[in-house]
């Protein structure tokens, strides 16, 4: 099993541009999680899905952030417009 697959591995963009991060969860997993990690703020849960349905997006109250899971094998996290303080490592995770 390839595990969770994210793309892109690295992203550099200008402030104000749209950024889209993509995730392919492990096949058969029905929960998907997006996290953000920075030195200043630590690890933050942004949103999680269960059976493709968003359950809790309270970690991303800014409406610049949106996430979708159109099917069981794909999710996107979009930032529009992006800001310098969005610079972070974004993790996708999945679970049974």
């Amino acid at each position: 099993d390839a595990g969770v697959i994210q793309s892109p591995r690295h992203e550099v963009t200008e402030m104000g541009q749209e950024v889209t991060l993509r995730c392919k969860p492990i096949s058969g997993h029905n929960s998907l999680f997006w996290y953000r990690q920075t030195m200043m703020r630590g690890l933050e849960l942004l949103i999680y899905f269960n059976n493709n349905v968003p359950i809790d997006d309270s970690g991303m109250p800014e409406d610049r952030f949106s996430a979708k899971m159109p099917n069981a094998s794909f999710s996107t996290l979009k930032i529009q417009p992006s800001e310098p303080r969005d610079s972070a490592v974004y993790f996708c995770a999945s679970s049974l």
Epitope: E44, L45, L46, S58, E62, R64, Q80, P81, E83
Partner: antibody
Framework: EVQLVESGGGLVQPGGSLRLSCAAS????????MHWVRQAPGKGLEWVSY????????YYADTLKGRFTISRDNSKNTLYLQMNSLRAEDTAVYYC??????????WGQGTTVTVSS | DNQLTQSPSFLSASVGDRVTITCRAS?????IYWYQQKPGKAPKLLIY???NLAPGVPSRFSGSGSGNEYTLTISSLQPEDFATYYC?????????FGQGTKLEIK
Amino acid sequence: EVQLVESGGGLVQPGGSLRLSCAASGFTFSNFGMHWVRQAPGKGLEWVSYISSGSSTIYYADTLKGRFTISRDNSKNTLYLQMNSLRAEDTAVYYCARRGEKAMDYWGQGTTVTVSS
Amino acid sequence: DNQLTQSPSFLSASVGDRVTITCRASSSVNYIYWYQQKPGKAPKLLIYYTSNLAPGVPSRFSGSGSGNEYTLTISSLQPEDFATYYCQQFTSSPFTFGQGTKLEIK
């Protein structure tokens, strides 16, 4: 029925501290982000702070960072605001509000904080 | 911080009038949210995502706009609509409010 009930306000001297509480009922508290908003006498609304459902994401108004601390206890269905080094300009009605469709869809009735010597 | 400026700050109107309140943002926002507040009461959500009515809000209220400029319109004022209205943005923290528009009976 969604209910938010604030408490803990009162009269405090400048430099003093208060802890506000917001008791939630009528919904699954642990599934929602929560805000604090304040309103000085005769003035408009001022956003204070936000905390996500599991407390991993927290935001503050820039002017309040370092003096105010937001927290929550999901086992008690309660939101808190610890306010230290209080100033006269912190005098206001403090509201807690639930984050719904990004916006604040339910509000408490407010608790009054007066900072005066 | 993204500053929201509402105009007018005060508005006198009569029952049945059509009124429009404008909210301008110093930086572009994705959406605007509107609240109504009556004296001594907590604010009440009216409109979210610029144009969606909150549950229980009468259809005489509507919202529109994009970018830096947004509007709240009341198509035919009712006695219970006389209140103060606030816009708010959630595009970027801190989640600023406008200064408010007080709608008074003429």
